[in-house]
């Protein structure tokens, strides 16, 4: 149903990383515009991205209000220049998105090694605690603030002179590992949420190696 010159949106897809959340859909509009609505399962619909010719809508501001809620969005199609026009049933055409629960589904962004410090045969590696757009008491929360101990980091490390890798894990943002004296090591980290079944792991961080700017070496 619907007017002869509008088509319903399709392929509605959530794209979300560290809670920055965008709804995407198809098709590119021809003589039509879109409006998006979002709601929790029990809440009222809120309209966003009014009469847009884009095929995406940033819904971050809505989902960060409660990242543990499950959200549903829908995309309405209207004829361009005649947004009051409706489908044959008296309503504009629309298509529902899949359900989306940010806490369970947002992708983990690529982490960054903030620093590493060697003291004798120990190295302390610190992972940057990335800020999210989730707010509490007017302050933005970090990834660790939001996920707590549900979020862990795996450190991959290896001697610059060798291919054999080792791993360590932490549910803070710091690792303390043993290294061989006089050897340079390289490091990479990955974020993981073990309790998830999908979107469990981030991509690996860029590799950082000792003897480069980020680190600090202290002989004790």
């Amino acid at each position: 149903s619907g007017t002869t010159n509008t088509v319903a949106a399709y392929n509605l897809t959530w794209k979300s990383t560290n809670f920055k959340t965008i709804l995407e859909w198809e098709p590119k509009p021809v003589n039509q515009v879109y409006t998006v609505q979002i709601s929790t399962k029990s809440g009222d619909w809120k309209s966003k991205c009014f009469y847009t010719t884009d095929t995406e809508c940033d819904l971050t501001d809505e989902i960060v209000k409660d990242v543990k809620q499950t959200y549903l969005a829908r995309v309405f199609s209207y004829p361009a220049g005649n947004v009051e026009s409706t489908g044959s049933a008296g309503e504009p055409l629309y298509e529902n998105s899949p359900e989306f629960t940010p806490y369970l589904e947002t992708n983990l962004g690529q982490p960054t090694i903030q620093s590493f410090e060697q003291v004798g045969t120990k190295v302390n590696v610190t992972v940057e605690d990335e800020r999210t757009l989730v707010r509490r008491n007017n302050t933005f929360l970090s990834l660790r603030d939001v996920f707590g101990k549900d979020l862990i980091y795996t450190l991959y490390y290896w001697k610059s002179s060798s291919s054999g890798k080792k791993t360590a894990k932490t549910n803070t943002n710091e690792f303390l590992i043993d290294v061989d004296k006089g050897e340079n090591y390289c490091f990479s980290v990955q974020a993981v949420i073990p309790s998830r079944t999908v979107n469990r792991k981030s991509t690996d961080s860029p590799v950082e190696c000792m003897g480069q700017e980020k680190g600090e070496f202290r002989e004790i």
Partner: antibody, heavy 117, light 107 residues
């Protein structure tokens, strides 16, 4: 239902090589590392290493570097372990298992390898 | 590399009794430790993860405690099917070493 189905028992001669397969089902293969563990008769469990199926990156215990090679085939959601230069010391049961970061929660049934002339 | 010392190697007990198995690590693991049960001819089965958390479907008579370098595993009110082998595993780092195992025998 999550399952890891391993290939059948192997009887090989010293110096030969063997490949053990571990066909997974019931979960998203690329989201979980696959562990490999050895258990010699009446002994404890020895960690061989693991592979991240998403990118093929491998980690080995030093005792198994050069002995074991871990690979995956994402299209068939199967992990493989290739063992080379086999000796009687390699006779054991070999397990694959799914790593959930905090533990290993599902295991294959085990593959018995016997190295004998 | 971190070493794990599991004790006792074997223990005899009676039905209904409680037993405790210990694992000591040569370096701190925080709570990155798991416990497994293995029945003869079978694969290991996860009982406890993150030192204290009971895996899905595991009876509540099994429990884990400890952090750092000392960890304990307890079975209260032993059942006939509990007289098998138990292993601890460090999951903090690689190599992901297992303890030598504890064989639980019926007295």
């Amino acid at each position: 239902e999550i399952q890891l189905q391993q290939s059948g028992p192997e009887l090989v001669k010293p110096g030969a090589s063997v490949q053990v397969s571990c066909k997974t089902s019931g979960y998203s293969f690329t989201h979980f590392n696959v562990y490999w563990v050895r258990q010699s008769h009446g002994k404890s469990l020895e960690w061989i290493g693991y592979i991240d199926p998403d990118n093929g990156i491998t980690f080995y215990d030093e005792n198994f570097m050069g002995k074991a090679t871990l690979t995956v085939d994402k299209s068939s959601t199967t992990a493989f372990m290739h063992l080379n230069s086999l000796t009687s010391d390699d006779s054991a049961v070999y397990f694959c298992a799914r790593d959930v970061t905090t533990a290993v929660d599902f295991w294959g049934q085990g593959t018995t390898l016997t190295v004998s002339s | 590399d971190i070493q794990m010392t599991q004790s006792p190697a074997s223990q005899s007990a009676s039905l209904g009794e409680s037993v405790t198995i210990t694992c000591l690590a040569t370096q701190t693991l925080d709570t990155w430790l798991a416990w497994y049960q293995q029945k003869p001819g079978k694969s290991p089965q996860l009982l406890i993860y993150a030192a204290t958390y009971l895996a899905d479907g595991v009876p509540s008579r099994f429990s884990g405690s400890g952090s750092g370098t000392k960890f304990s595993f307890k079975i209260s009110s032993l059942q006939a099917e509990d007289f098998v082998n138990y292993y601890c595993q460090l999951v903090y780092s690689s190599p992901s070493t297992f303890g030598a195992g504890t064989k639980l025998e019926l007295k």
